[in-house]
C-alpha cells in the first residue's frame, strides 16, 4: 500500500452541528478552570519539522494520548459534554487505527514526547489544558486529516 | 462478570489510620476506561462519594475529606486502595468499592463495616 | 457543584406503579444521574443512568419493571408492577464537578 493512504477522515465527521458544538462546549468549560495561559499544547511547535503529508499521523498520536491520558482518567468531569465527546472521539481514533507511515517519524516522535512530558509535567492542571485545547484538536484533525 | 470485595480491619481506634482495599475479580484494574471510587455509608444514613483513581494515576477526592484521604493502585495484584487518617467516631461507616463509567457508578462491592472505637 | 433532590419516602400498592423524582440543582439540569437501589441490609446496586433526553441505559439483570425518564431538570425512575422485593432505598447520583453527589434517598414501602 502506498504511505499515507489510511491516514484520511471522512469530512462527514467535522460536519455534525451537535457533536462539534459539544467538542467546543467541552474545551470551553475546562478553558475556564485552567489557570495556566502561558503554556499551549497545540500550536506551531507541534507541527515543526513535520511535512503536511505527515500531520495526520503526528495528529493520531495525539488523539491516542488525548483520549487514553487525559479523558478516560477525568472521564467523570465536565458534565454532560464528556460523555458525548469520548464516543465521537474514539470512533476517530478507530478510524486512524490503520494510519502509519513508512518514512523517519523522529521529529513526530519528539514533538509527540514534548507535548506528552508537558502535561505530565503540569500533572492535573496539564489534563485539564488538555481538554481546553480539543478545539485545537478537533480543527487540527481536520485540517490534517481530510 | 466484574466484581469487587472489599476487605477491611472491621475495628479502628480513634486517631488512627483506616485502611481498605478492593479487589477485582472477572476484569482488569488497568481498563482505561474506567474509574475506581471509593464511597462510604455510616450506619442508617445516606451516602457519601470519598475519591476515585484511574489505574494511571489520576486521582481525585471529596473536598470535605481531601486531607485525610489518600487512594491508590496496585495493577499487579488487580486491586486498589483507601486509607484515611486520624479517624474519629464520624468515621464509622460502611465503605463501599465502586467501578465508574463515564461518571456513572455502575458496579458496587458488597461492603466492609469500619468501627472506629477504642 | 449539584444538588440532587429527593422525597423521603413513597409507596404504592403490590402491583402497582411508583414514579420516583430526582430534581438537579439550577444551572446542572443538563447532567446524566445514576440510580441506585439499596434493599434492607445490604449494599447499593446500580440500577440504570438516564440522560436529560430521558434515554437510559440499565444495568445487568435489572427487570423490564425499571424504566428510568426526564423532564427538565427532573430524572424520574419508574417502577411498574410493583413487587414485594422492590422495596428499598432509591438513591440517585450525579457527578462532573470533580466530585461525585448523592441524593438523600427516597424509601419505597410496597403496600399490602
Known amino acids: 500500500l502506498p504511505v499515507n493512504t489510511r491516514c484520511k477522515l471522512e469530512v462527514s465527521n467535522f460536519q455534525q452541528p451537535y457533536i462539534v458544538n459539544r467538542t467546543f462546549m467541552l474545551a470551553k468549560e475546562a478553558s475556564l478552570a485552567d489557570n495556566n495561559t502561558d503554556v499551549r499544547l497545540i500550536g506551531e511547535k507541534l507541527f515543526r519539522g513535520v511535512s503536511a503529508k505527515d500531520q495526520c499521523y503526528l495528529m493520531k498520536q495525539v488523539l491516542n494520548f488525548t483520549l487514553e491520558d487525559v479523558l478516560l482518567p477525568q472521564s467523570d468531569r465536565f458534565q454532560p459534554y464528556m460523555q458525548e465527546v469520548v464516543p465521537f472521539l474514539t470512533k476517530l481514533s478507530n478510524q486512524l487505527s490503520s494510519c502509519h507511515i513508512s518514512g523517519d517519524d523522529q521529529n513526530i516522535q519528539k514533538n509527540v514526547r514534548r507535548l506528552k512530558e508537558t502535561v505530565k509535567k503540569l500533572g492535573e492542571s496539564g489534563e485539564i489544558k488538555a481538554i481546553g485545547e480539543l478545539d485545537l484538536l478537533f480543527m487540527s484533525l481536520r485540517n490534517a486529516c481530510v | 462478570q466484574v466484581q469487587l470485595h472489599e476487605s477491611g480491619p472491621g475495628l479502628v481506634k480513634p486517631s488512627e489510620t483506616l485502611s481498605v482495599t478492593c479487589s477485582l475479580s472477572?476484569?482488569?484494574?488497568?481498563?482505561?476506561?474506567?474509574?475506581w471510587a471509593w464511597i462510604r455509608q455510616p450506619p442508617e444514613k445516606g451516602l457519601e462519594y470519598i475519591g476515585r483513581i484511574h489505574y494511571r494515576g489520576s486521582v481525585s477526592y471529596n473536598p470535605s475529606l481531601k486531607s485525610r484521604a489518600a487512594i491508590s493502585v496496585d495493577t499487579a495484584k488487580n486491586q486498589f486502595s483507601l486509607t484515611l487518617s486520624a479517624v474519629t467516631a464520624a468515621d464509622t461507616s460502611f465503605y463501599y468499592c465502586?467501578?465508574?463509567?463515564?461518571?456513572?457508578?455502575?458496579?458496587w462491592g458488597q461492603g466492609t463495616l469500619v468501627i472506629v472505637s477504642s | 457543584q449539584p444538588v440532587l433532590t429527593q422525597s423521603p419516602s413513597a409507596s404504592a400498592s403490590l402491583g402497582a406503579s411508583i414514579k420516583l423524582t430526582c430534581t438537579l440543582s439550577s444551572g446542572h439540569s443538563n447532567y446524566d444521574i445514576a440510580w441506585h437501589q439499596q434493599q434492607s441490609g445490604k449494599g447499593p446496586r446500580f440500577l440504570m443512568r438516564?440522560?436529560?433526553?430521558?434515554?437510559?441505559n440499565k444495568g445487568d439483570g435489572i427487570p423490564d419493571r425499571f424504566s428510568g425518564s426526564s423532564s427538565g431538570a427532573e430524572r424520574y425512575l419508574t417502577i411498574s408492577s410493583l413487587q414485594s422485593e422492590d422495596e428499598a432505598d432509591y438513591y440517585c447520583?450525579?457527578?462532573?464537578?470533580?466530585?461525585?453527589?448523592f441524593g438523600t434517598g427516597t424509601k419505597v414501602t410496597v403496600l399490602g
Open positions: 472477572g476484569g482488569s484494574i488497568s481498563s482505561s476506561s474506567h474509574l
Open positions: 465502586a467501578r465508574l463509567d463515564m461518571g456513572a457508578i455502575d458496579k
Open positions: 438516564v440522560n436529560n433526553g430521558g434515554s437510559h
Open positions: 447520583q450525579t457527578w462532573g464537578t470533580g466530585t461525585h453527589v
